[in-house]
Interface confidence: medium
């Protein structure tokens, strides 16, 4: 490993939408790929009327937008889907929104959801 | 080397059965969800069905639902796809692809497809 | 169902040009874009996924963008092996699907 680089082995696993996609709901997503790949975690949620609602958890592979982000932070303002990804083991348990563009919110989610 | 050789394929009748295989290799094949894909003569392509990684969820196109049938079996590193009720429309190119992650985020590898027609 | 719209269908152009495609969904499906390219009578091959990541061995003028609902593919510099028929796909959601595909034909 390249010194200094969190390296991400797995995630938390989560899919709102499980019994359409016909996948697990909750769990810890082991992360595979190409070995010259980097893995990140990640975490899409919606924010409606003040309400969290996670959409998704889990693997996300070589991105550089998540490249050495030790948090999972959206600073894009207001988007319709919130999205961030992180690199390290489970770092996407906790996700914020800290936009670029105005006065900073933080929404963030410290709930884990248990595995099933 | 990832390596995904569909068989199978063939000329069968209006109502007819078969079985595509995809003989997979160069990768821990029990970790990943697979995907059947297919392209009909001079047509784009058409998601048709994907398992995960040790087979317990499924999930079909609504155009196969019923009629198809996606498995797998990890001690021979195989994926499969038994067709029923073969219709016409279901004449194509058939690929099967390996998943990159649970959510599948993207089909990274590709086998080279084997043709299935259906006619009288 | 999400629908994929792919533009244009079909394009000509030069060895050195610089192409784009575009690609849309009907709702948005944040990065869940990926880009495949296929050569007649072969099989499809991963170009870009995550909507802006290269996928391994493909070249660096291959390049993707966008978030939502509308994305891009552009190749800076074309080359004679880059004439293929390029599709758009979205793994937001069940089912899987494609754009209809553009075909990049020499001018």
């Known amino acids: 490993a390249i010194l200094g680089r969190s390296e991400t082995q797995e995630c938390l696993f989560f899919n709102a939408n499980w019994e359409r996609d016909r996948t697990n709901q909750t769990g810890v997503e082991p992360c595979y790929g190409d070995k010259d790949k980097r893995r990140h975690c990640f975490a899409t949620w919606k924010n409606i009327s003040g309400s969290i609602e996670i959409v998704k958890q889990g693997c996300w592979l070589d991105d550089i937008n998540c490249y050495d982000r030790t948090d999972c932070i959206e600073k894009k303002d207001s988007p319709e889907v919130y999205f961030c990804c992180c690199e390290g083991n489970m770092c996407n348990e906790k996700f914020s929104y800290f936009p670029e563009m105005e006065v900073t919110q933080p929404t963030s989610n410290p709930v884990t959801p248990k595995p099933p | 080397e990832v390596q995904l050789l569909e068989s199978g394929g063939g000329l069968v009748q209006p109502g007819g059965s078969l079985r595509l295989s995809c003989a997979a290799s160069?990768?821990?094949?029990?970790?990943?969800?697979m995907h059947w894909v297919r392209q009909a003569p001079g047509k784009g392509l058409e998601w048709v069905a994907s398992i995960n990684y040790n087979g317990g969820y499924t999930s079909y196109a609504d155009s196969v639902k019923g009629r198809f049938t996606i498995s797998r079996d990890n001690s021979k590193n195989t994926l499969y796809l038994q067709m029923n009720s073969l219709r016409a429309e279901d004449t194509a190119v058939y690929y099967c692809?390996?998943?990159?992650?649970?959510?599948?985020?993207?089909?990274?590898?590709w086998g080279q497809g084997t043709l299935v027609t259906v006619s009288s | 169902d999400i629908q994929m719209t792919q533009s244009p269908s079909s394009l000509s152009a030069s060895v050195g040009d610089r192409v784009t495609i575009t690609c849309r969904a009907s709702?948005?499906?944040?990065?869940?874009l990926n880009w495949y390219q296929q050569k007649p009578g072969k099989a499809p091959k991963l170009v870009i996924y995550?909507?802006?990541s290269r996928a391994s061995g493909v070249p660096s003028r291959f390049s993707g963008s966008g978030s939502g609902t509308d994305f891009t593919l552009t190749i800076s510099s074309l080359q004679p092996e880059d004439f293929a028929t390029y599709y758009c796909?979205?793994?937001?959601?069940?089912?899987?699907?494609f754009g209809g595909g553009t075909k990049v034909e020499i001018k």
């Open positions: 709702q948005s499906i944040i990065t869940y």
């Open positions: 796909q979205q793994s937001y959601e069940s089912p899987l699907t």
């Open positions: 995550a909507a802006t």
């Open positions: 160069g990768f821990t094949f029990s970790d990943y969800g």
């Open positions: 692809a390996r998943a990159a992650t649970w959510h599948d985020t993207h089909l990274d590898y």
